[in-house]
């Protein structure tokens, strides 16, 4: 067991252009507070829920009011450390999220308003018992400077807080075979109290005779990787050669919920239902009331004002968790059809539809030509969420409102001359050619190539194209 400690040194504008506006104003004074969330392992895809190692909330900082015209300075910070207690071994590698929250202190209807100013995250290696590690992280235009360390709670020592130490029984030296407990030189490493044979790499103990396994290991001595042990099926055929897979321990095995909390398995992790007066991922935090503002993301806190009275966070749509700390990405399954853009507004999902589509999920294909008139005898053609007009001869443009020059495209072949006409165009063909566009040569014997000239028109006559 031990404690992860976080010391915030400063939060303010980062270097470079684009300094952020101060989060507080004379009209709207505010104060800051911080939340830290820890989970074991270096993988961002770790199986644990958010904050599986624990989470902590800082006190509120001093009230701050911006001086008009002044750039945002480093903002006044809460006093003290953020402390995240851990019950089991320190994992050595961990991921963190540090959130900077703003509490507005103006005349709010329904109490203070909280909003997230910045969130930084990282993955680090850290041995328990080591010195403070310093860090700088940037989130947009903001910069957060902080230090952190993990320390073991006596009698635990070591880089994972799994070795136990006891005060020396004699002033001069430790007993036979026992080493001094660095860095606590006045203490001695306790005699082996774990169950005999308990794996030194994958097991640890807090009480004499026990053997508790680190994640991924199982068996009485923590020597068996989860889900690969060979066993005899307790209810199946009793053949000594039958190998089977034992499901690994569930997240509620050993009840990770402190202070009498009850554990239930969730789809990927666990959830503690805490008794009155306790909260946190493992019910490890006590004495929190609505006055402490435990509900995030605009959650409404309901409960008594005294520490023994439980509180409940009523979360707005899009958030869940006992403190409304989990965001649900409701756009993830692409609810908007036909290429619509999904917007999760928190209180509702909204789809921004492409042209030609409508409906709450862009599911309706609009009649592109409905209510669309094409001028001058043009006809409307639907297609792909837009409409276009097929214009009559002599007209053009999106709605056939523009008068076109029918001769602009030089439609008369073989040197024929083009004349604009009220109903289209007329080609006057050069000698030896005929047809509406002068496209057919006239044979020397006077017969024309197909198609035959319409009756009443001699080759060479102007051909009016209707």
């Amino acid at each position: 067991a031990g404690v992860f400690e976080l010391q915030i040194h400063s939060f303010g504008p980062g270097p470079g252009p684009g300094a952020p506006r101060s989060p507080c104003s004379a009209r709207l004074p505010c104060r800051l507070f911080f939340r830290v969330c820890l989970k074991p392992g270096l993988s961002e895809e770790a199986a644990e829920s958010p904050c599986a190692l624990g989470a902590a909330l800082s006190a509120r900082g001093p009230v701050y009011t911006e001086q008009p015209g002044a750039p945002a300075p480093d903002l006044p910070l809460p006093d003290g450390l953020l402390q995240v207690p851990f019950r089991d071994a320190w994992p050595g590698t961990f991921s963190f999220i540090i959130e900077t929250w703003r509490e507005e202190l103006g005349d709010q209807i329904g109490g203070p308003a909280w909003s997230l100013l910045a969130r930084v995250a990282g993955r680090r290696r850290l041995a328990a018992g080591g010195p403070w590690a310093r860090d700088i992280q940037r989130a947009g235009a903001w910069e957060l400077r902080f230090s952190y360390r993990a320390r073991c709670e006596p009698p635990a020592v070591g880089t994972a807080c799994t070795r136990l130490c006891r005060p020396r029984s004699a002033p001069s030296r430790c007993g036979p075979g026992l080493r001094p407990c660095a860095p606590l030189e006045d203490e001695c490493e306790a005699p082996l109290v774990c169950r005999a044979g308990c794996s030194p790499e994958h097991g640890f103990c807090e009480q004499p005779g026990e053997c508790r396994c680190l994640e991924g290991w199982t068996g009485p001595l923590c020597t068996v990787p989860v889900s690969t042990s060979s066993c005899l099926s307790p209810r199946g055929p009793s053949s000594a050669t039958t190998g089977c897979l034992v499901p690994g321990p569930g997240p509620c095995d050993g009840n990770p919920c402190a202070n009498g909390g009850s554990c239930s398995e969730t789809p990927r992790s666990f959830e503690c239902t805490c008794p009155r007066g306790f909260y946190g991922l493992r019910c490890e935090v006590s004495g929190v009331t609505c006055a402490d503002g435990p509900c995030f993301n605009g959650g409404l806190c309901v409960g008594g004002a005294d520490p023994d009275s439980a509180y409940i966070c009523h979360c707005p749509p899009g958030f869940q968790g006992s403190n409304c700390e989990k965001r649900v990405d409701r756009c993830s399954l692409q609810p908007c059809r036909n290429g619509g853009l999904c917007l999760d507004l928190g209180h509702a999902l909204r789809c921004r539809c492409r042209a030609g589509f409508a409906g709450p999920r862009c599911e309706h294909d609009l009649d592109d030509c409905a209510g669309r008139a094409c001028a001058n005898g043009g006809t409307c053609v639907e297609g792909g969420g837009a409409h276009r007009c097929s214009c009559a001869l002599g007209f053009g443009g999106r709605d056939c409102r523009e008068r076109a020059d029918p001769c602009a495209a030089r439609p008369c072949a073989h040197g024929g001359r083009c004349y604009a006409h009220f109903s289209g165009l007329v080609c006057a063909c050069a000698p030896g050619y005929m047809g509406a566009r002068c496209e057919f040569p006239v044979h020397p014997d006077g017969a024309s190539a197909l198609p035959a000239a319409p009756p009443g028109l001699r080759p060479g006559d102007p051909q009016r194209y209707l």
């Epitope: 829920s49 239930s264 789809p267 990927r268």
Partner: antibody, heavy 124, light 106 residues
Framework: QITLKESGPTLVKPTQTLTLTCTFS??????????VGWIRQPPGKALEWLAH???????RYSHSLKSRLTITKDTSKNQVVLTMTNMDPVDTATYYC????????????????WGQGTLVTVSS | DIQMTQSPSSLSASVGDRVTITCSAS?????MYWYQQKPGKAPKLLIY???NLASGVPSRFSGSGSGTDFTLTISSLQPEDFATYYC?????????FGQGTKLEIK
């Protein structure tokens, strides 16, 4: 196009072990957020969730059947295998596998694609 | 275990009717999921995260509710909607389904 297909024996004797394989295509269990679950439905009865497995090998088993169930995945073959020991006639049901999606760490977004199911009869 | 109770268990209605199916959880759940199943077929996801329409599901289907009480509504019943409907919770293990509501033609 996402598809899932269950395969395994249609008839199992009491006390035997049932092994069912779900072969899927159109998604990968190496992709963050993806999972595969098993659900069964006795004839004329309601659906019952049995187990599921996530991309990162996190597994869940129904409490009432935990001692009898094992779920494993073979990412390279796009397969998930469910074994159920000590079969009993009351285990006669259609067994379905389905894709589960979780875009938040602990919130299931949906169980959105299902196989057509395979009827398993337990009888001596 | 969280028990899911659907009502009614069966329902007769006509094409064009507005139909409401309710699902009550024995303890609070964050979200509800609804499935449609036709005889001899696999279930099909209709609604996820309480109110979101699954891909390909007509907009006459809608979901609502919070806490322990949730509702599936079909605004104007179509012939292809006659089926059995199930609700499900993903809050805690075991991840239970309702007993089903059979929607029949009147």
């Amino acid at each position: 196009q996402i598809t899932l297909k269950e395969s395994g024996p249609t008839l199992v004797k009491p006390t035997q072990t049932l092994t069912l394989t779900c072969t899927f295509s159109g998604f990968s269990l190496s992709t963050s957020g993806m999972g595969v679950g098993w659900i069964r439905q006795p004839p004329g009865k309601a659906l019952e969730w049995l187990a599921h497995i996530w991309w990162d090998d996190v597994k869940r088993y129904s409490h009432s059947l935990k001692s009898r169930l094992t779920i494993t995945k073979d990412t390279s073959k796009n397969q998930v295998v469910l074994t159920m020991t000590n079969m009993d006639p009351v285990d006669t049901a259609t067994y379905y596998c389905a894709r589960i999606v979780s875009f938040d760490n602990d919130v299931v977004s949906a169980m959105d694609y299902w196989g057509q199911g395979t009827l398993v009869t337990v009888s001596s | 275990d969280i028990q899911m109770t659907q009502s009614p268990s069966s329902l007769s209605a006509s094409v064009g009717d507005r139909v409401t199916i309710t699902c009550s959880a024995s303890s609070s759940v964050s979200y509800m999921y609804w499935y449609q199943q036709k005889p001899g077929k696999a279930p099909k996801l209709l609604i996820y995260l309480t109110s979101n329409l699954a891909s390909g599901v007509p907009s006459r289907f809608s979901g609502s509710g919070s806490g322990t009480d949730f509702t599936l509504t079909i605004s104007s019943l179509q012939p292809e909607d006659f089926a059995t409907y199930y609700c499900q919770q993903w809050r805690s293990n075991p991840f239970t389904f309702g007993q089903g509501t059979k929607l029949e033609i009147k």
